[in-house]
Interface confidence: medium
């Protein structure tokens, strides 16, 4: 049985003989109906009307009307994207005259559904202080004190200290809101590798080859394992501390439930997913009475172990 | 041109330590901007990465969850190669082993050189 | 882990044609962190792709990569006799783990 579709919610846009057609809602797979899309608004293949059609999947295309945004004149800036149309998710770069930029340090907008995000114009930036580092165990040796945006200095590491990556040496940026980063120079036997890889989890971001010292990564476990520990693991000293463990769901399946004549209380699931230290209700099949204690019915899920209830 | 050369026996047997050398020649194994690996390709389970060491200012190992508990990768610098170790085998450690480099930055895993691989079978 | 899904398994396609093969990731993957390898029997896998797009040293204009969060593919514009093999994608941005691979085979 192929799923009908019902009335067309055209954001932005709407049905022509929009009124006359709404009865006849919903409609089969298969169907063709033409609509319009609204002022700053328009259809994937770039008109103001198209056709929306009844698939297996619901409404194609599944966004009808796509916003449209024009390229302002930027003062300050670069003109070659000038009275360009852009449409609801694309980005372009802004380029800025020398001293001017986006906003906090952006370098491209992108056309959204309200329009521009954020809007494209070229504010006058701040520069960046020599001042304003602070560098434990190394040093800058350039002679500068005052640094224009997107200038790049580099700064070196006493013997026996590194950066993030192990090098000797790095480089920080001026940027928007001041420098890129603080320059980071630290005993390199306090850094640590990737954070250990657990069972039935991963770790929330990309993994990095070295981590400085205090570095903090988030783990989450595989849907119905349950996060036993902290869900963070911090480096310190060279060692991660304790990671988390993903403990083993309890899966209630169809198969044991009839072996031992049972069934779910309140519910019908074939399959039934618990985690440890959920109580699971069970109850006697029709025709069926019970073998084993009152409190057996009412089991407790254990790291994957759950003890079933008989009735004969 | 840089090379990796694979050495090590061709048969294991259960419960016994798998041991296989992996020589460096045009690259150091304590370059700051590589890691040193071995990954293992078998019918049942495709290519799996086992794990890699590499220096950073200090040595880091890095192993696979699914053979955490029973490898361990040396770098040996006097004679520029590195090692892997996997003890307490099973026929289904049956594969094919190679050792490869790894030349991305600090975020990035991907393997630009391989040796030739070594076909280890466990059995009795 | 991320589970790499290659599609089709096997694919027959005469020298001249354009490949197009897939690698879909059981949760997003960022374009940075995938990379192709080709590999011909008895040998070792070969690099072509990494960061999703950028080719690595050496190989055809031909090969392109492409795609974002858990959709990638593979693209041989122009296959030549050389291009039949196993082709592979691989994720490394949280642990690293290979997909099954794809049989490119002469049609």
């Known amino acids: 049985q192929v799923k009908p579709c019902d009335f067309p919610d055209i954001k932005h846009g709407g049905l022509f003989h929009e009124n006359m057609r709404r009865p006849y809602f919903p409609v089969a797979v298969g169907k063709y109906y033409s609509y319009y899309c609204d002022e700053h608004f328009e259809t994937p293949s770039g008109s103001y009307w198209d056709y929306i059609h009844c698939t297996q999947n619901g409404w194609s295309p599944a966004v009808p009307c796509l916003r449209k945004c024009y390229f302002p004149y930027l003062e300050n800036g670069y003109n070659q994207n000038y009275g360009r149309k852009f449409v609801q998710g694309n980005s372009t770069e802004v380029a800025c005259h020398p001293g001017y930029g986006l906003p906090k340090a952006q370098t491209t907008v992108t056309c959204t559904e309200k329009g521009w995000s954020p809007t494209p114009r070229c504010i006058r930036v701040r520069t960046c202080s020599k001042s304003d580092i602070e560098i434990e165990n190394g040093f800058i040796s350039e002679s500068s004190s005052i640094y224009i945006l997107n200038k790049e200095i580099q700064y070196k590491c006493k013997p026996g200290y590194a950066t993030a990556d192990g090098n000797s040496s790095g480089s920080i940026t001026c940027l928007q809101n001041g420098w890129s980063a603080q320059p980071i120079c630290i005993n390199s036997s306090e850094k640590c590798g990737p954070p250990p890889p657990i069972s039935n989890g991963d770790t929330t971001s990309f993994l990095l080859k070295v981590y400085v010292p205090q570095s903090r990564v988030e783990y989450q476990c595989q849907p119905y394992y349950e996060l036993q520990g902290s869900n963070y693991v911090t480096c310190s000293n060279g060692e991660w501390s304790e990671p988390p463990r993903c403990i083993h769901p309890c899966i209630i399946t169809e198969e044991n439930m009839n072996k031992n004549n049972i069934k779910l209380k309140g519910r019908s699931d074939r399959k039934y997913y618990a985690k440890t230290g959920d109580t699971i209700e069970f109850m006697c099949k029709l025709g069926y009475n019970a073998n084993t204690s009152i409190l057996s019915f009412q089991a407790v899920c254990r790291e994957g172990i759950v003890e079933y209830p008989r009735c004969e | 041109q840089v090379q990796l050369q694979q050495s090590g026996p061709g048969l294991v047997k259960p419960s016994q330590t798998l041991s296989l050398t992996c020589a460096i020649s045009?690259?150091?194994?304590?370059?700051?901007?590589?890691?040193w690996n071995w990954i293992r390709q078998s019918p049942s389970r495709g290519l799996e990465w086992l794990g890699t060491t590499y220096y950073r200012s200090k040595w880091f190992n890095v192993y696979a969850v699914s053979v955490k508990s029973r490898i361990t990768i040396n770098p040996d610098t006097s004679k520029n190669q590195f090692s892997l170790h996997l003890n307490s085998v099973t026929p289904e450690d049956t594969a094919i082993y190679f050792c490869?480099?790894?030349?991305?930055?600090?975020?990035?895993?991907?393997?630009?050189?391989w040796g030739r691989g070594t076909l280890v079978t466990v059995s009795s | 882990e991320i589970v790499l899904t290659q599609s089709p398994g096997t694919l027959s396609l005469s020298p001249g044609e354009r490949a197009t093969l897939s690698c879909r990731a059981s949760?997003?993957?960022?374009?940075?962190?995938l990379a192709w390898y080709q590999q011909k029997p008895g040998q070792s896998p070969r690099l072509l792709i990494y960061g999703a797009s950028s080719r690595a040293t050496g190989i055809p204009d031909r090969f392109s990569g492409s795609g974002s969060g858990t959709d990638f593919t593979l693209t041989i514009s122009r296959l030549e006799p050389e291009d039949f093999a196993v082709y592979y994608c691989q994720q490394y941005g949280r642990s690293v783990t290979f997909g099954g691979g794809t049989k490119l085979e002469i049609k």
């Open positions: 949760q997003s993957v960022s374009s940075s962190y």
């Open positions: 045009g690259d150091s194994v304590s370059s700051n901007s590589a890691s």
């Open positions: 490869t480099r790894d030349r991305g930055d600090l975020l990035h895993w991907y393997f630009d050189l």
